[in-house]
């Protein structure tokens, strides 16, 4: 059984009158229909919530909105609707919240039917003032602030024009008419895809891709043919149709779509999809949807410049496009990802990689947990986790697992001990090293959050009931204290709490349960007089990330380096704080074959770290396009896996000879590339 | 198998400093915490402080914080503990212990391998 | 830091007996907790670790248990070798040691 409230755990003291103290309600004065929450900036504490409610009329649906904001992390909120004057938010764009600590927020609004445009309303104080903007156009997207300048706008309008705005929305312009996607690249650059004929849908496949450096004042045409593309860490992906038949490609690019290279991965036909997984600057996860309606594909991993792909994990569950996948990265280790694979016997298993899909492995089964029924072995089982796949399929799972950067190791999720995944009811696990172990935190299924970088965690039970009660653990979820927060319990809708994980604040969303009217509440709970000190050194532990097996000298060793980190012990109760650092200690590795992917056209055999030829490709040169070449590779087998820092210890060369030939891909040969100004 | 060699019996004056040393034979050194631990004549055990080899990343008890040093040399397999400032009561038997260690916690789990002590006497 | 506190400091007993002995934290350790047999002349030996895990070659007679604030060490049946000096160890702070159980001949 999990552990829990027992006389074992080290209660805080005092802790119902510290948290009652801490405890502020607010009650919305709103009849219930959806509300959006939306942080502005970081550490401000501004918080805005958007409420709406339709009004089903005889011939068309009234909405009303109402906007508050708080600005101590959602203790008190203050009606600012006439800040906006008292217009129909849109809520399917959202709150459009600046960049960083840019304190801008865009608002777009409802408008009649006959109107020329639609109307913004614009904060650049953090939503103390609003400035309200007719545009020239119907937006269909939510805009899109740029990543490096918060004043540069774009969004695509009903009309399929894309507009940019300079001046944070004042004024609009209409760069460029047939407008399928856009998006921001690095340094304000957007790229965007046209059609020339009927419309996005009728052109798929005979898309161009376009690129504009300088808000629209010129453009180049960087791509032909084109179904879709993508931006994932320094990578610009392009999937190209082919010239003979219906399959595509994907091509990639490092330097904003000047050079493209083919991309070594299987080709896909109409029905198919590949999907960016995950990218960073050093390489890119890859999903290839697998002939037929699978509802799986093989996940590749790539080199550094997103061109040679090897062989992650196959059968990898991925319904059709645009559907569920479990991929999750554990963003309190480096190197870790979970996801699901569809077993031959349609059972779904999940499967974790600690070394960046190199290798992967089933979770080890939790010490204080049985196996299930789904279970041919009482004794030998592993832990399955649910994740988006088990969300869409409605099962009682309220919560996609959860790991924050500056909570080491913690990874929490909902999940089942057996064979597979099960339907039954779900308990909640939690890992404090990143995944290599696991323990049942919770029984049942609960909402859960994790504040003050890990130093409390916070869970309330998914239930179908009215709730009061609140749970939390100082010791990373190994004991747990209940604290009723209301007298009258409320039907619960979800834990808010800042993004990052370092806040003491945590935001309980319901409705009141009265029998005649549901109104919006809201209580927020400060933990800081829980945590009464800030914690000092002597509060820490050195912790050894990924070790296995402390008798190998390269314990610990994971893409070439290892890794210290001073962790919170479990036993002190105090405060992180906000400004909390990680503190991590790198040292180098030795190299060993582990820190080499299998080259193109070879392949590790199961439980070996060698590489070896595919049968099909044995003898064979190895011919790929990079830069609108041909290359030939000549390769021993391996090449360093991206991010890998090793020095010294074993180091198989590869060579790549260039035969400065030209591609065989027609895929936007110099010749056909153009510019055009405005 | 791994052990742990102390250095020999010390004699000091008060106000003067002693470096005791611990060289690891057979196993890993570098990946296992080495704590010191001292005991005075008829008394109890008493934790000094400690420090992992890899990054030389050593933490003391406040008791000692600001007289004793702890360092390790990772290619001599070795840890030194030194006390400064000693007075009477720093007379005592003086033991070098290796962290066992079963994750990645370098303190967690016990002193699995102890040396055979060194005792200090401090005597003007 | 966490205090650690054991009892009794004296404990007097015969080969053959079942023998406890308790430790006390000053809050809550989890389950960081070791026991330690000690010899005169000699240095400590480890006997459990986590509070309840035996140490590899120590005989079975050895168990622990606990969490959270109260552990107990006990001997199911003392032999004539299990006189010594028997110490806790709180490993989830800086590392305090009980101040020692003296288990001797009845």
């Known amino acids: 059984s999990a552990p829990g409230e027992d006389e074992e755990c080290g209660r805080v003291r005092d802790f119902v009158a510290k948290l009652a103290n801490n405890t502020h309600q607010h009650v919305f004065d709103d009849l219930r229909g959806s509300v959006s929450l939306s942080w502005v900036g970081d550490s401000t504490g501004v918080i805005l919530v958007l409420t709406t409610f339709h009004v089903p009329l005889v011939i068309m649906t009234f909405g009303q909105s109402k906007l508050y904001r708080s600005e101590d992390y959602g203790k008190n909120f203050k009606d600012i609707t006439d800040l906006i004057n008292n217009t129909f938010i849109r809520t399917e764009f959202g709150m459009a919240i600046g960049p960083e600590n840019s304190g801008k927020v865009v608002l777009t609004a409802e408008v009649s039917g006959g109107s020329r445009g639609g109307r913004i309303f614009r904060s650049s104080d953090f939503a103390k003032n609003f400035v309200q903007t007719d545009l020239p156009f119907h937006p269909l997207t939510q805009m899109m602030y740029s990543p490096q300048n918060s004043d540069y706008l774009l969004a695509l309008s009903t009309e399929n024009g894309l507009w940019v705005s300079k001046n944070f929305g004042g004024k609009w312009e209409e760069i460029h008419k047939a407008v399928c996607l856009a998006k921001w690249g690095s340094d304000n650059t957007i790229f965007f895809t046209t059609y020339a004929n009927g419309s996005c849908k009728a052109d798929l496949g005979a898309l161009e891709l376009w690129r504009t450096s300088d808000l629209g004042k010129s453009f180049k045409t960087i791509g032909v043919k084109i179904y879709s593309f993508g931006l994932g860490g320094r990578f610009l992906f392009a999937s190209v149709m082919a010239d003979k038949d219906t399959t595509r490609r994907i091509h990639v690019s490092t330097d904003q779509g000047d050079t493209w290279s083919m991309a070594q991965l299987p080709s896909v036909g109409q029905e198919q999809f590949y999907s960016i997984l995950a990218a960073n600057d050093d390489m890119v996860f890859m999903h290839v949807d697998e002939p037929g309606d699978t509802g799986f594909g093989t996940i590749f991993t790539s080199d550094d410049r997103g061109i040679v792909y090897s062989k992650s994990l196959d059968r990898h569950l991925y319904t059709t496009t645009g559907g569920e996948t479990d991929f999750t990265n554990v963003t309190s280790l480096r190197g870790v990802y979970i996801t699901s694979v569809l077993s031959e016997d349609n059972s779904i298993q999940t499967m974790i990689t600690f070394d960046q899909g190199g290798r992967w492995t089933h979770l080890r089964k939790p010490e204080n947990s049985e196996c299930d029924a789904t279970a041919k072995n009482k004794n030998e089982c592993s832990l399955h986790i649910h994740a988006s796949y088990s969300i869409s399929q409605k099962l009682n799972v309220p919560m996609a697992p959860l790991s924050e950067p500056n909570a080491v190791g913690i990874v929490i999720a909902h999940g089942s001990v057996g064979d597979a995944i099960s339907v039954m009811v779900p308990d909640v696990y939690i890992s404090d090293d990143g995944g290599y172990s696991w323990t049942k935190m919770l029984e049942g299924p609960h909402y859960y959050t994790i504040l003050d970088s890990g130093g409390i965690i916070v869970a309330i039970e998914h239930s179908s009931r009215p709730i009061n009660v609140i749970k939390f653990s100082t010791d990373e979820g190994q004991c747990w204290q209940t604290y009723t927060f209301t007298r009258d319990p409320i039907y619960f809708t979800g834990l808010a709490s800042e993004p990052g994980a370092r806040s003491m604040n945590i935001s309980i969303w319901g409705f009141t349960a009265s029998f005649l009217t549901s109104q919006w509440v809201s209580y927020t709970i400060d933990f800081k007089d829980i945590l009464e000190r800030n914690c000092e050194e002597k509060d820490y532990t050195i912790w050894l990330a990924h070790s296995t097996d402390p008798e190998d000298y390269e314990d610990g060793c994971i893409l070439g380096y290892k890794e210290q980190f001073l962790r919170l012990r479990k036993s002190s109760v105090c405060q992180n704080g906000r400004d909390y650092v990680v503190t991590k200690q790198p040292s180098i590795c030795l190299c060993s074959l582990e820190d080499f992917l299998c080259d193109f056209g070879y392949y590790r055999p199961e439980n070996d770290s060698k590489c070896v030829e595919q049968p099909e490709l044995k003898g064979h040169d190895l011919e790929f396009c990079l830069y609108g070449r041909e290359e030939h590779l000549t390769t021993n087998g391996y090449r360093k896996i991206p991010g890998d820092k090793c020095q010294g210890g074993v180091n198989p060369v590869r060579e790549v000879k260039d035969l400065k030939k030209k591609c065989t891909s027609n895929f936007l040969s110099p010749e056909k590339q153009n510019s055009k100004s405005n | 198998q791994v052990q742990l060699v102390q250095s020999g019996a010390e004699v000091k004056k008060p106000g003067s400093s002693v470096k005791v040393s611990c060289k690891a034979s057979g196993g890993t050194f570098r990946n296992y915490a080495i704590s010191w631990v001292r005991q005075a004549p008829g008394q109890g055990l008493e934790w000094m402080g400690g420090?992992?080899?890899?990054?030389?990343?050593?933490n003391y008890a406040q008791k000692f914080q600001g007289r004793v040093t702890i360092t390790a040399d990772e290619s001599t397999s070795t840890a030194y503990m030194e006390l400064s400032s000693l007075r009477s009561e720093d007379t005592a038997v003086y033991y070098c212990?290796?962290?066992?260690?079963?994750?990645?916690?370098?303190?967690?789990?016990?002193?699995?391998?102890w040396g055979q002590g060194t005792t200090v006497t401090v005597s003007s | 830091d966490i205090q650690m506190t054991q009892s009794p400091s004296t404990l007097s007993a015969s080969v053959g007996d079942r023998v406890t002995i308790t430790c006390r934290a000053s809050?809550?350790?989890?389950?960081?907790l070791a026991w330690y047999q000690q010899k005169p002349g000699k240095a400590p030996k480890l006997l459990i670790y986590?509070?309840?895990s035996l140490e590899s070659g120590v005989p079975s007679r050895f168990s622990g248990s606990g969490s959270g604030t109260e552990f107990t060490l006990t001997i199911s049946s003392l032999q004539p070798d299990d006189f010594a000096t028997y110490y806790c160890?709180?490993?989830?702070?800086?590392?305090?040691f009980g101040g020692g159980t003296k288990v001797e001949i009845k």
């Open positions: 986590k509070a309840s």
């Open positions: 809050q809550s350790i989890s389950s960081w």
């Open positions: 212990a290796r962290q066992g260690r079963k994750t990645g916690y370098y303190y967690y789990y016990g002193m699995d391998v």
């Open positions: 160890q709180q490993a989830d702070g800086h590392i305090t």
């Open positions: 420090i992992i080899p890899i990054g030389g990343w050593a």
